[in-house]
Amino acid sequence: QKPSIGKCSVDIQQNRTKTTERPDLLNCPIYWQQVQEKCLLFSHTVNPWNNSLADCSTKESSLLLIQDKDELTRTQNLIHDKAISFWIGLNFSLSEKNWKWINGSFLSSNDLKITGDAKENSCVYISQTSVYSEYCSTEMKWICQKELTLVRNKVSPDSWL
Amino acid sequence: QKPSIGKCSVDIQQNRTKTTERPDLLNCPIYWQQVQEKCLLFSHTVNPWNNSLADCSTKESSLLLIQDKDELTRTQNLIHDKAISFWIGLNFSLSEKNWKWINGSFLSSNDLKITGDAKENSCVYISQTSVYSEYCSTEMKWICQKELTLVRNKVSPDSWL
């Protein structure tokens, strides 16, 4: 079976000549919701962490990356049930003995406080109130993110977003 | 360190009223190259397969999914050195005893011919001439893809791309 691939609108470069730029404001796709500068997709179904990562990837998005405590709180405020948990893009790197975001950066000590073991095959999920680690093979809901950017209708070669 | 996140222009919905649609043709972002309906990013650095998957995800893209032999050939033609190898979005599923694309579909027997072991922790890479399996922990270059779509400047609520 051929791999069927989700689509994502990439940055526009209509032609290579210098033109006037007019930004269009964007909203988020169906099923996604806007939170500050991001579109978030809170899954309803469940997956192991790796499959969640792959699902976001095939949607040309990323498992949620949380910049700071404010963003964590904003995201947790959108979780409507205290019994529901969502994988985010953070797991334990055994070789580096540290929590690592999927973009390669490490968790800084004053960011999220993770309850649970920091060991091999530990991945991180958030609930309405807390941040936990769990075996990555556990099936849970997950959150994908797309950055919400401006698309310029006419752009010059050096004006990529 | 905070997670820094790549941007991707998501589908445009300028307002909720019915408006005229005018498609804009798209080109690929800087560093990416257009191959048919896709934008491809050939990495310069190396990573284990899992980190490559995560990197594409944070770029709001996917590890390369190859539809057929023609696409394989087109991609291989862009590899300028026969000694260079690139991870793609295909690995061995031990539980299902089959090669599996990261979007969940299985490799059909008449698609790619993979040289190497089909076993646990085997991931697939391509070179200028062939398709191989290797331990997923091996560090290699990788290829990310974004689907190249049309963005409509003015869209009605039900006309998401």
Epitope: Q1, P3, S4, I30, Y31, L41, S43, H44, T45, V46, N47, P48, N51, D55, T58, K59, E139, W142, C144 | E96, K100, W101, N103, G104, S105, F106, P157, D158
Partner: antibody, heavy 121, light 107 residues
């Protein structure tokens, strides 16, 4: 062609068992949660059971809990429903259904043609 | 479980008429509501999802609206092929539930 094809229905006595199968083609089966939905003759639609994409999580309607078991084999692109201790009220056309988006349980954009299960003595 | 109450249970209409069907949820479901059309002997067909999004290939005379607990399916200018039974379905929480159906008949 994108399709779902159910099989395994038939006439069975109360207390008996049947195993329904649903063969999927034309889409990435292993990426989607899947459901069984049934419709008794002349009645409305009733969701029966769902299974996650990886197969590790299952849910059931109260009316079938403890009697029916949903499973899947992603390598064969096939969904199953094992029905035990069948009752007259289980008589229905059984549909398998795929959600529109891989993050969702429902919003079923693809349905099989259905297979009729008749429970009667 | 979330109950969905559809009204009316049946409606008689003529070609060209505007038909409105309502679906009320027993608790708030945000915009997680879908509408299906079913013809005798056939599987249901998805018309509307996420309360107001038209499924690909569905004619634009079908539209959906609402959020929270009250939702509406509207068929503008009813066509002969639209005579069928229509169901709403919530996707907010499991178990997934369907409304009882609305039969659109020829007057």
């Amino acid at each position: 062609e994108v399709q779902l094809l159910e099989s395994g229905g038939g006439l069975v006595q109360p207390g008996g068992s049947l195993r329904l199968s649903c063969a999927a083609s034309g889409f990435t089966f292993g990426q989607y949660a899947m459901s069984w939905v049934r419709q008794a003759p002349g009645k409305g639609l009733e969701w029966v059971s769902a299974i996650s994409a990886a197969g590790g999580t299952t849910y059931y309607a109260d009316s079938v809990k403890g009697r029916f078991t949903i499973s899947r084999d992603n390598s064969k692109n096939t969904l199953y429903l094992q029905m035990n201790s069948l009752r007259a009220e289980d008589t229905a056309v059984y549909y398998c259904a795929k959600p529109l988006d891989s993050s969702q349980w429902a919003d079923f954009d693809l349905w099989g043609r259905g297979t009729l299960v008749t429970v009667s003595s | 479980d979330i109950q969905l109450t559809q009204s009316p249970s049946s409606v008689s209409a003529s070609v060209g008429d505007r038909v409105t069907i309502t679906c009320r949820a027993s608790q708030g479901i945000s915009s997680w509501l879908a509408w299906y059309q079913q013809k005798p002997g056939k599987a249901p067909k998805l018309l509307i999802y996420a309360a107001s999004s038209l499924q690909s290939g569905v004619p634009s005379r079908f539209s959906g609206s609402g959020s929270g607990t009250d939702f509406t399916l509207t068929i503008n200018s009813l066509q002969p092929e639209d005579f069928a039974t229509y169901y709403c379905q919530q996707a907010w929480v499991l178990p997934i539930t369907f409304g009882g159906g609305t039969k659109v008949e020829i007057k």
